[in-house]
């Protein structure tokens, strides 16, 4: 059965907290991803960026969550209209920014 929106958001926040707290070496070997516009469709936008990171065990669960929560199919290399034009950041910074935004959404009760 589908994950309730509040549960999905809470689980994703918990996983991102886990990643940031357990980070030792550079996350995903310092891989860079497109920065995204966090104001709309956050699950799909985040997935469209993070799906282009391969071989990073630390974010595999996050990728699975986003893939489950995003209602449409996303593939690596897909152009995202939601990305911030020509701006790439490290995965570690992406995760931190995403976490801050998701915590804000949770506090405001915006679960969808």
């Amino acid at each position: 059965s589908p994950v309730p929106p509040s549960t999905a958001l809470k689980e994703l926040i918990e996983e991102l907290v886990n990643i940031t707290q357990n980070q030792k070496a550079p996350l995903c070997n310092g891989s860079m991803v497109w920065s995204i516009n966090l104001t709309a469709g956050v699950y799909c936008a985040a997935l469209e960026s993070l799906i282009n990171v391969s071989g990073c065990s630390a974010i595999e669960k996050t990728q699975r969550m986003l893939n489950g929560f995003c209602p449409h199919k996303v593939s690596a290399g897909q152009f995202s209209s939601l990305r911030v034009r020509d701006t790439k950041i490290e995965v570690a910074q992406f995760v931190k920014d995403l976490l801050v935004h998701l915590k804000k959404l949770f506090r405001e009760g915006q679960f969808n």
């Epitope: 391969s54 893939n67 489950g68």
Partner: antibody, heavy 118, light 111 residues
Framework: EVQLKESGPGLVAPGGSLSITCTVS????????INWVRQPPGKGLEWLGM???????DYADALKSRLSISKDSSKSQVFLEMTSLRTDDTATYYC????????????WGQGTSVTVSS | DIVLTQSPASLAVSLGQRATISCRAS??????????MHWYQQKAGQPPKLLIY???NLESGVPARFSGSGSRTDFTLTIDPVQAEDAATYYC?????????FGGGTKLEIK
């Protein structure tokens, strides 16, 4: 062009050790994961283990005590070592790359045949 | 480990007909609403080739006569219509958990 090539000893004595190297080209081992899979003659595929781009290693439970997987990313090589070999370890050993998420194995080497016999 | 059981072990299908291969998992391979089940084709003397990922998504370059379906523990690979070049052994594989596993394989013969 993505390529993987296994190289092994061919023949190993029972009780001995096996070392196989997977040399890759067309991609980097720092951001791709490599699996090891074997296939005994006339039988099915068995997943042995994998090494992730970020260095994490997962092993098949049944073989964990006899297996060791490592890599040298600068040389584009992944290594499989197996100890205490038995005749039923005779197989073709493949290395295979994980693609992007959801991490199915999208490129395979041609395999190297290993016979365990005295 | 999750055990994958394929059936039948072998089947013979006439050219142009439909071939159906089943894969049953000992426990669910679903995670966050997606099924982490993939299908491979292996022809004699060759390494396996990825056909379908996430239960139903066709890998790039794979003909549309191949399709996959299923969720949780029950999955199906369908080839319709079967062509002569489809003679091969087909394997399901899961990566729902860290220890990946393959099914035992199904050998397809074309009549």
């Amino acid at each position: 062009e993505v390529q993987l090539k296994e190289s092994g000893p061919g023949l190993v004595a029972p009780g001995g050790s096996l070392s196989i190297t997977c040399t890759v080209s067309g991609f980097s081992l720092t951001d791709s994961s490599i699996n090891w899979v074997r296939q005994p003659p006339g039988k099915g595929l068995e997943w042995l283990g994998m090494i992730w781009g970020d260095g994490r290693i997962d092993y098949a439970d049944a073989l964990k005590s006899r297996l060791s997987i490592s890599k040298d990313s600068s040389k584009s090589q992944v290594f499989l070592e197996m100890t205490s070999l038995r005749t039923d370890d005779t197989a073709t050993y493949y290395c295979a790359r994980d693609g992007y998420f959801p991490y199915a194995m999208d490129f395979w080497g041609q395999g190297t045949s290993v016979t365990v016999s005295s | 480990d999750i055990v994958l059981t394929q059936s039948p072990a072998s089947l013979a299908v006439s050219l142009g007909q439909r071939a159906t291969i089943s894969c049953r998992a000992s426990e669910s391979v679903d995670s966050y609403g997606q099924s982490y089940m993939h299908w491979y084709q292996q022809k004699a003397g060759q390494p396996p080739k990825l056909l379908i990922y996430l239960a139903s998504n066709l890998e790039s370059g794979v003909p549309a006569r191949f399709s996959g379906s299923g969720s949780r523990t029950d999955f199906t690979l369908t080839i319709d219509p079967v062509q002569a070049e489809d003679a091969a052994t087909y394997y399901c594989q899961q990566n729902a958990e860290d220890s990946r596993t393959f099914g035992g394989g199904t050998k397809l013969e074309i009549k």
